[in-house]
Amino acid sequence: SPVPFGPEGRLEDKLHKPKATQTEVKPSVRFNLRTSKDPEHEGCYLSVGHSQPLEDCSFNMTAKTFFIIHGWTMSGIFENWLHKLVSALHTREKDANVVVVDWLPLAHQLYTDAVNNTRVVGHSIARMLDWLQEKDDFSLGNVHLIGYSLGAHVAGYAGNFVKGTVGRITGLDPAGPMFEGADIHKRLSPDDADFVDVLHTYTRSFGLSIGIQMPVGHIDIYPNGGDFQPGCGLNDVLGSIAYGTITEVVKCEHERAVHLFVDSLVNQDKPSFAFQCTDSNRFKKGICLSCRKNRCNSIGYNAKKMRNKRNSKMYLKTRAGMPFRVYHYQMKIHVFSYKNMGEIEPTFYVTLYGTNADSQTLPLEIVERIEQNATNTFLVYTEEDLGDLLKIQLTWEGASQSWYNLWKEFRSYLSQPRNPGRELNIRRIRVKSGETQRKLTFCTEDPENTSISPGRELWFRKCRDGWRMKNETSPTVELP
């Protein structure tokens, strides 16, 4: 279990030790003001009490100031994501100050030791911010701390210790081990800044969760449920690197939070939207695509400030690479009769046809089971903007197309050999677009033919009432 009381071991061991002089040792925490997008360019080093570098390097007191805080490191050197993030911030906010917090000597340790160093690094950042606050025109409200992994909790400590309140902290997959369930002041929390937004991309409910599972911000966004990220499977990383390993999968999923944030900076015209939901399963059912009462938000840099009384967990699906944006649809299918279903859950696919494009064949994920005489809700998403939807093709996969279903079919036949043909009846499909918040009802092409059975398809066209807006707020509209 963790060593109580942080940086120098147990609390009672924290006696005041004399500090080493500047000539003896390089400081463990350095503040590198990045004056160029070029990672080879050295930039300027800032230190508390020394105003000259601020002037020499044109530190803009009235502009936004970003502090990028790395996490635990096995290599002891800056990773590529950091340079990409610096470059993206410079591209998006040309006048801003971008400061890289270099705590590599304290992070290149055993993980437990690096964790125990987070408090002291947070304190160093707070001291730097307290000193900057003494300057005319510098405002803590313009400060945005961006921390990855262990760096997210360092940002939390900085926000905790600083005199005043920083404007924003973004936690990019905050570290899980030794922080899950930790005291509010011992991890990133909503109290640490005026707005704390968090991206969770490597959470696991089984085994070791590299990223923290519990919400720690004002808004906590869980792309793809916060666990398995598209493009990060063993097959994917095996294809892209010479020696694919589990380590690469971990890195891919954990680091995905950074790339989602970079994407939000550089692909401003393709924002990804997340939707508030109590849990991942409900989101997968398509229940949570509302934008009412601040229930949706942009992710990453463009997130709108939300300070709810209670934490807001938000979900979205993404593509496997940049730009990560997808288009979410809620599909409500009312099954009004059900014939000889047996024990097999049907496997449905839909194809959406729009004014701009047609989708691929998309599976309808049955999270629990198909209910009869009830409305069943599904989530589907497309990588391309289909425009206005025109028609939908619903296909019921035949048993032979799935080994699992074939086996269940066979078992069902053994117990009920004279089981007549299975079918169900669907009159209409209601669709809601997450991105536009528009709703549309589709009716069967032939009102007399509403039945569907394995290996068959049903076509639905827009019903006469067309698109309905129903007082929903589009996420593309500025949220309050």
């Epitope: 109580p4 009381f5 609390l11 924290k14 707070a126 005291d183 509010i184």
Partner: antibody
């Protein structure tokens, strides 16, 4: 070792104020939150609020807001809790506790009696 | 505010007994729960933090478990020095809130 030493017992009249002190030693005073928790006779524990000595940031239980003030003196590593407009229900033992993993270390408690 | 409801409010047990105390949060607090022991006339002592981690010097007979809204403190074999009052507390959000306490008495 970590120690929190509180001031002595107080007897106050209704409407008066009381100021309890808590002197910390054995750790870096400025970077750990110190909470105040009270316990009425025969009752459970009630969190009143906490202070971070380095920045003097405070968090208060809204039940006590307006009546409680927490301050610190970094030169003596001491925190103070002042409760005003005392009433008989404020009769309790008041504890200070330093937070890291939880309330890791507690003071010995200060008994405050409110009686006319 | 998050309410913490502890049960039972008191129990009688003998030395060597296995004792279980439960705590229920009014909303999800994940694993951000601590347990304290308080003896008459003494200050509380931290036993368990983050739902299941024993604090320094706490005997292994004390075990914490649970996540979400339901938490348990178990004393595997009650010792004479364990007769005391036990409190749970959520440390997920401010205001911090305590359970009402469970008094463990000698049967």
């Amino acid at each position: 070792q970590v120690q929190l030493v509180q001031s002595g017992a107080e007897v106050k009249k209704p409407g008066a104020s009381v100021k309890v002190s808590c002197k910390a030693s054995g750790y870096t005073f400025t970077t750990y939150w110190i909470a105040w928790v009270r316990q009425a006779p025969g009752q459970g524990l009630e969190w009143m609020g906490e202070i971070l000595p380095g920045s003097a940031k405070t968090k208060y239980n809204k039940k006590f807001k307006g009546r409680v003030t927490m301050t610190r003196d970094t030169s003596t590593s001491t925190v103070y809790m002042e409760l005003s407009s005392l009433r008989s229900e404020d009769t309790a033992v008041y504890y200070c506790a330093v937070y890291d993993y939880g309330a890791d270390y507690w003071g010995q408690g200060t008994t405050v009696t409110v009686s006319s | 505010d998050i309410q913490m409801t502890q049960s039972p409010s008191s129990l009688s047990a003998s030395v060597g007994d296995r004792v279980t105390i439960t705590c229920k949060a009014s909303q999800d607090v994940y694993t951000a729960v601590a347990w304290y022991q308080q003896k008459p006339g003494k200050s509380p002592k931290l036993l368990i933090y983050s739902a299941s981690y024993r604090f320094t010097g706490v005997p292994s007979r004390f075990t914490g478990s649970g996540a979400g809204t339901d938490f348990t403190l178990t004393i595997s074999s009650l010792q004479p020095e364990d007769f005391a009052t036990y409190y749970c507390q959520q440390h997920y959000s401010i205001p911090r809130t305590f359970g009402g306490g469970t008094k463990v008495e000698i049967k």
